[in-house]
């Protein structure tokens, strides 16, 4: 099974995305019909166990010898992987302050809905993206970023917060999802796996990528995050998959080279300002979009997720540095810090390009299963 390819005359090569049928009919993924990762019963928030068994056996995809993000999602093969009884690495720990239920963690107690009831909501993130079910929305225009090229001073805080590495961004980074949909960037952080284990949060037809970057934004309609939580469109996250490539990514190296300084949980350092947009794919025109939630407690909903079709390339050494440098709580490595994919529950993922069109010889007619819901279409 291959992700669909776009027409060869497509300027940037093609894309893939995928979605659950909002009607919940036979196109809804089940354990049998797609290699997507299913959530273990009653364990919405355990990463690893829902990880596609044997994903490390997926064929390696060699990037095209172009620029940083020349690999597109539709270039990735997906395979039915055999069952793998191996337990995921457990990066859990015992809370240092007893049974305080506010101390959430990956891969164990307390259940996230006990930490925050919103984590049991119906429209949670991350999700599995299925290309054939994405709704092409021509109204989704290229993203606009302004002020993302930061000068070296003032320096920025890079912190190991125990569940990710986070770069706090200064005021002035403006992003627009479209006319009247304006946001300010607040922070960025990463999600990753472990040696031989991918760790992206979103998946594409069940394929989990090595890592994922999230740039979190606040709507200009709100002054503070606490006012925007749970409000539709109050927060927006730009997400991109990180993929292995042949060359070192110089933009990421500015952060990765500093991870040793913050190996210990809670530690922080100051790093010179950098071009934040260089951490993202270069193609701002092809992406998937849906409404979901924060992927960590409090799991507030109403978050607009924009997942780039193009991936970002890091060297194997850089990906190893990311997944093997930081320490989390309880003397455990900070690894596998991703949430299980969550059910769509009728949501349709929209695509800014015809991601669901299959131009391979076997498809006589392009098929688009879902209609665009965007205003103006």
């Amino acid at each position: 099974q291959r992700l669909p390819r776009m027409q060869e005359d497509s300027p940037l090569g093609g894309g893939s995305s995928g979605e659950d049928d909002p009607l919940g009919e036979e196109d809804l993924p089940s354990e049998e019909d797609s290699p997507r990762e299913e959530d273990p019963p009653g364990e919405e928030d355990l990463p690893g166990e829902e990880d596609l068994p044997g994903e490390e056996d997926l064929p390696e995809v060699k990037p095209k010898s172009e620029e940083e993000g020349s690999l597109k999602l539709e270039d990735l093969p997906t395979v039915e992987a055999p069952g793998d009884p191996q337990e995921p690495q457990n990066n859990a720990h015992r809370d240092k302050e007893g049974d305080d239920q506010s101390h959430w963690r990956y891969g164990g107690d307390p259940p996230w809905p006990r930490v925050s009831p919103a984590c049991a909501g119906r429209f949670q993130s991350p999700v599995d993206i299925r290309p054939q079910l994405a709704a092409f929305c021509p109204a989704l225009r290229p993203l606009e970023l302004l002020g993302f090229q930061l000068p070296p001073l003032p320096e920025l805080r890079l912190r190991n917060n125990g569940h990710s590495v986070q770069l706090t961004l200064p005021p002035g980074l403006e992003m627009a999802l479209g006319p009247g949909r304006e946001y300010r960037a607040l922070q960025l952080h990463l999600h990753w796996g472990a040696a031989g284990r991918p760790g992206s949060e979103h998946t594409v037809e069940g394929h989990r990528f090595p890592a994922e970057i999230h740039v979190v934004h606040l709507s200009t309609a709100f002054a503070r995050v606490d006012e925007a939580l749970g409000r539709p469109g109050g927060l927006a996250v730009l997400a991109a998959f990180l993929e292995e490539g042949p060359e070192e990514n110089s933009a990421y190296e500015q952060l990765l080279s500093r991870l040793e300084e913050i190996a210990e949980e809670g530690s922080e350092t100051q790093v010179p300002g950098l071009d934040i947009s260089a951490l993202l794919p270069s193609d701002f025109s092809r992406y998937f979009q849906y409404e979901g939630s924060l992927t960590t407690p409090p799991c507030a909903q109403g978050v607009i997720w924009t997942v780039f079709n193009q991936t970002v390339m890091l060297s194997a050494k850089q990906l190893h540095t990311l997944s093997d440098t930081l320490w989390g709580p309880g003397d455990s490595r900070l690894q596998l810090n991703f949430r299980a994919t969550q059910p769509l529950n009728g949501r349709v993922i929209e695509a800014s390009f015809p991601a669901g069109v299959d131009s391979s010889p076997r498809a006589a007619e392009p098929v688009q299963l879902n209609s665009c819901l965007a205003a103006g279409d």
Partner: nanobody, 117 residues
Framework: QVQLQESGGGLVQPGGSRRLSCAAS???????????VAWYRQAPGKQRELVAV???????KYSDSVKGRFTISRDSAKNTVLLQMNSLKPEDTAVYYC????????WGQGTQVTVSS
Amino acid sequence: QVQLQESGGGLVQPGGSRRLSCAASGNSVNIFSFAAVAWYRQAPGKQRELVAVITTTGGTKYSDSVKGRFTISRDSAKNTVLLQMNSLKPEDTAVYYCNADYLQDYWGQGTQVTVSS
């Protein structure tokens, strides 16, 4: 709108103790349950420096200058974060600020701690 308020500052003799409190108010969200919370301090003419931080997992980290003397703790039920300061030294004199990293930075107004005989 969430607001942070520090309290507990004042004049203390060298070798003495003080407990600072950071309280969050103004929103139903229990911000300290989901934020890494830190105490920073700034002495006159110096840069603001990290003193202690407690993460969402309950992990704690201290600057070398206060390790073994200061303890940070969180009471999520009361929505407060405490900084217990023991064996205070004159060089601990500074304005102490509470910071909550909750997708964005929230800061308090600061409380003055003066260590002097």
